[in-house]
Amino acid sequence: SWMWNQFFLLEEYTGSDYQYVGKLHSDQDRGDGSLKYILSGDGAGDLFIINENTGDIQATKRLDREEKPVYILRAQAVNRRTGRPVEPESEFIIKIHDINDNEPIFTKDVYTATVPEMADVGTFVVQVTATDADDPTYGNSAKVVYSILQGQPYFSVESETGIIKTALLNMDRENREQYQVVIQAKDMGGQMGGLSGTTTVNITLTDVNDNPPRFPQSTYQFKTPESSPPGTPIGRIKASDADVGENAEIEYSITDGEGHEMFDVITDQETQEGIITVKKLLDFEKKKVYTLKVEASNPHVEPRFLYLGPFKDSATVRIVVDDVDEPPVFSKLAYILQIREDARINTTIGSVAAQDPDAARNPVKYSVDRHTDMDRIFNIDSGNGSIFTSKLLDRETLLWHNITVIATEINNPKQSSRVPLYIKVLDVNDNAPEFAEFYETFVCEKAKADQLIQTLRAVDKDDPYSGHQFSFSLAPEAASSSNFTIQDNKDNTAGILTRKNGYNRHEMSTYLLPVVISDNDYPVQSSTGTVTVRVCACDHHGNMQSCHAEALIHPTGLSTGA
């Protein structure tokens, strides 16, 4: 039977002689040269040759494991004389053993990593990996060990895994942010003679909130005019924070001080400044100086750094209110006055009052804005603000007069204020009632007595407090008429009634009835209106057929009474 072990051969042999691989040997070989060894298969006769007498195998060429890691050859042992096999043909392996001809190569030339500042020692940063093309199954040619060449004492690397960790306590980003670490990967388990490769790891410390905000000064002073409307920014304060991003975000608040109600502080997200703004209207005459306590704090606090102290700071803000020459202020936002429409010229209606709110208390003068009183119906006493009439009024023409009064500082005419003045004209019974319309009515020749032929209505331009109450009667000259009568309905209407049976249009075609209408206000006003009644021919249903008088015999057909 065959006697061999697996054959091994080192790759990339550099000797001048053929490289000895091993010996094929059969236990049938008596050493007398009767056996002949034959080699076939992968690379036989080319890469590998055999001494047919001894069975010694040699490699003729420099081999490279990466071309073919294993060669499978066939061995035969035959009787030299007969050519018959002494052993069955058998296969064997020549395994090319790797020499350490490949250095470890990192998967990246440069790694980039981040780790939070102030991280505990041993915090994972990044894992680097190097690969080695040599055979990992043989020797240590591909056994890579990692070490740190640059970056101590800040970082360390696990020799077998390539995991980089923090190695120093309290690494402060605010002190140093960037680190360049150089890692070496060395094969042969890191032993002498091993091949190596390096990579650079750029490590950035990321920010944590380990710094509180700090005001660069303890006191700030700002000035603002008393006229500043709510929302007006009057000054900016800024606390500095050595952190970045959200860890440097600052919220400002007013925590104390007499101006708490009068001022606000808002945070400018862009600049991280606190903007002091006016909250309510200021008044120099009431308070000239305010003192506030403003606090700057981090909204995002990390509990593990609370021991470093409170993550807030305070400063005092002094606000000086500057006096502004303010216009006069009227005692009311608007004035409502009333006057009877029968008031004489120069009748005083009432008065307005305005005062300079400034400490100087400048005197004021009053005037009427003539754009609002084009007809100059009213006037004002420039000294005391009394309003009086300068023309006669008529409620029925204009019920309300809306005028504007101006108050101007005498010493500074630029400072003026305006106030609306609403003057109501009160009613006086100065208009007589009159017919609501022109009344021309008709009566049939065959009309019966006490027939209603017309209802009368009256109107009055006045507006009595208790409402209109009109009375109707025939004028004295027609009161005794035997033709028509008037009936007052006591509801501001009256009826014209026939007083006899039958009318002759040939005798009298038209009657003119004078009617007196009176109101019951003081002084009583009355007027006389005329109702025209025409006599008409009617059919038996009472429908008028003809009211024309052209067929009348008498030339005089008009009467004002009987």
Partner: antibody
Framework: QVQLLESGGGLVQPGGSLRLSCAAS????????MHWVRQAPGKGLEWVSF????????YYADSVKGRFTISRDNSKNTLYLQMNSLRAEDTAVYYC?????????????WGQGTLVTVSS | DIELTQPPSVSVSPGQTASITCSGD??????VHWYQQKPGQAPVLVIY???NRPSGIPERFSGSNSGNTATLTISGTQAEDEADYYC??????????FGGGTKLTVLG
């Protein structure tokens, strides 16, 4: 001329078995190591298994190890692949190929392939 | 273990030069072979041992291997060269590894 011809493919249910054959002609079959390579539909080539010229040494891809067995009968100039415990992901065209020392141990020639479909 | 990476596709105009790459860590230390596969056909060896052409393969096919990249070059590409191309090498012991394949499209 040198030729390889595969057979034995077909439809089989998951968990089933199939035996592929590769008939060689035009060269001394017993002098060459042989390989099986497969190609899933629309995918690339995947090496499956190797057998040395006399059949003493065999080797398998991790994906088929323990389920597939490569063998040869040099007297019949035939290469075999016994496939057991088949899975859907074994669906592919299976090629046999000769390892040619003269071409730096590359594969030349290849058979035309046989389709194996694993589906329920 | 070596891993071979190929671009999924490469396009070239007729008569132009097509280059198909196969990359892997220190690939220069490994012998690379190239195969051509046309639709519905078996693969055909076009380059062996990095840069050698088997008999019957046109001269326009050539190969190179250095650093981390092996390259198959087809100069004066013809329409009939449109196919999938695969690189291959020996891995550890008796295992074989293929690249993912590159589809070569000849435009026009």
């Amino acid at each position: 001329q040198v030729q390889l011809l595969e057979s034995g493919g077909g439809l089989v249910q998951p968990g089933g078995s199939l035996r592929l054959s590769c008939a060689a002609s035009g060269f001394t079959f017993s002098s060459y190591a042989m390989h099986w390579v497969r190609q899933a539909p629309g995918k690339g080539l995947e090496w499956v298994s190797f057998i040395s010229s006399l059949g003493s040494y065999t080797y398998y891809a991790d994906s088929v190890k323990g389920r597939f067995t490569i063998s040869r009968d040099n007297s019949k100039n035939t290469l075999y692949l016994q496939m057991n415990s088949l899975r859907a992901e074994d669906t592919a065209v299976y090629y046999c190929a000769r390892e040619t020392a003269g071409y730096g141990y590359a594969f030349d020639p290849w058979g035309q392939g046989t389709l194996v479909t694993v589906s329920s | 273990d070596i891993e071979l990476t190929q671009p999924p596709s490469v396009s070239v105009s007729p008569g132009q030069t097509a280059s198909i790459t196969c990359s892997g860590d220190n690939i220069r230390k490994y012998v690379v072979h190239w195969y051509q596969q046309k639709p519905g056909q078996a693969p055909v060896l076009v380059i062996y041992r990095d840069n050698n052409r088997p008999s019957g393969i046109p001269e326009r096919f050539s190969g190179s291997n250095s650093g981390n990249t092996a390259t198959l070059t087809i100069s004066g590409t013809q329409a009939e060269d449109e196919a999938d191309y695969y690189c291959q090498s020996w891995d550890s012991f008796l295992a074989v590894v293929f690249g993912g394949g590159t589809k070569l499209t000849v435009l026009g």
